[in-house]
Amino acid sequence: DGNSTRSPETNGLLCGDPDENCAATTTQSKRKGHFSRCPKQYKHYCIKGRCRFVVTEQTPSCVCDEGYIGARCERVDLFY
């Protein structure tokens, strides 16, 4: 199915806004810059989430699935 991943309406995609606090969903809060898809070599970088590339820094970051936290969405959020 072409839409098997979380739909953009619900996955926190807008967390890329330069002035938005993204601590809940990305590896850094108030991260500046723009995003693209992570290169293929990062296919499994995010354990429970979607990888996106910080264009200006050329580094991967993760948008975690609901209920997961951590730099690579590797930890269950006990407060979820």
Epitope: N11, L14, F35, R37, K40
Partner: antibody
């Protein structure tokens, strides 16, 4: 249903300008990156420009400095301002939705609008 | 800049298997997507991420990607499969398309 509808194409002289519009419906327009892709008569597809959901823009080399991509999320509309048009810009221009961020694939396309640059 | 090379045309007999290739330097390290375009119509995504099929695309369409070549395979080719097919990848913050392949279904 999810739909993209381009408009604004037509005949323009070399050196002239044109603004294309792409009206989106059936999805949360502001959440998606969008792109323009063109196809010259009898030729293949050529990506022209892309615009991220937070304003990041990127262009193919041949249109840099001449074309400007923009969006109005309140109107669910994508634009392509084309200046200093050349004969080689003659093509059908398609508006396409990038799946999620840049770097994915185009999962929704409009039907295209024809731009003809000729004297 | 990155280039994707496709054969200009491929012919297949009705009911047989067609294979369309897309060549590029270390293309296996990139995600490759395939679009079908019929005359006078907009392109339609038929394969994404090398081998995944969007909903509504028949199982006869499949893809693979390794080394320097990505391949779109169309099994049990039908007359309605006759179209132009384009591969696409992402390189250095820009989109790259192959030149396109015209698939002709014979018989």
């Amino acid at each position: 249903q999810v739909q993209l509808l381009e408009s604004g194409g037509g005949l323009v002289q070399p050196g002239g300008s044109l603004r294309l519009s792409c009206a989106a419906s059936g999805f949360t327009f502001s959440s998606y990156a969008m792109s323009w892709v063109r196809q010259a008569p009898g030729k293949g597809l050529e990506w022209v420009s892309g615009l991220g959901h937070v304003g990041y823009t990127t262009y193919t080399d041949s249109v840099k400095g001449r074309f400007t991509i923009s969006r109005d999320n309140s109107k669910n509309t994508l634009y392509l301002q084309m200046n200093s048009l050349r004969a080689e810009d003659t093509a059908v221009y398609y508006c396409a939705r990038d799946y999620l961020d840049f770097g994915y694939y185009f999962d929704v396309w409009g039907q295209g609008t024809l731009v003809t640059v000729s004297s | 800049s990155y280039e994707l090379t496709q054969p200009l045309s491929v012919s297949v007999a009705l009911g047989q298997t067609a294979r369309i290739t897309c060549s590029g330097d270390k293309i296996g390290k990139k995600y490759v997507h395939w679009y079908q375009q019929k005359p006078g119509q907009a392109p339609v995504l038929v394969i994404y991420d090398d081998s995944d099929r969007p909903s509504g695309i028949p199982e006869r369409f499949s893809g693979s990607n390794s080394g320097n070549t990505a391949t779109l395979t169309i099994s049990r080719a039908q007359a309605g499969d006759e179209a132009d097919y384009y591969c696409q990848a992402w390189d250095m913050q820009s989109v790259v398309f192959g030149g396109g392949t015209k698939l002709t279904v014979l018989g």
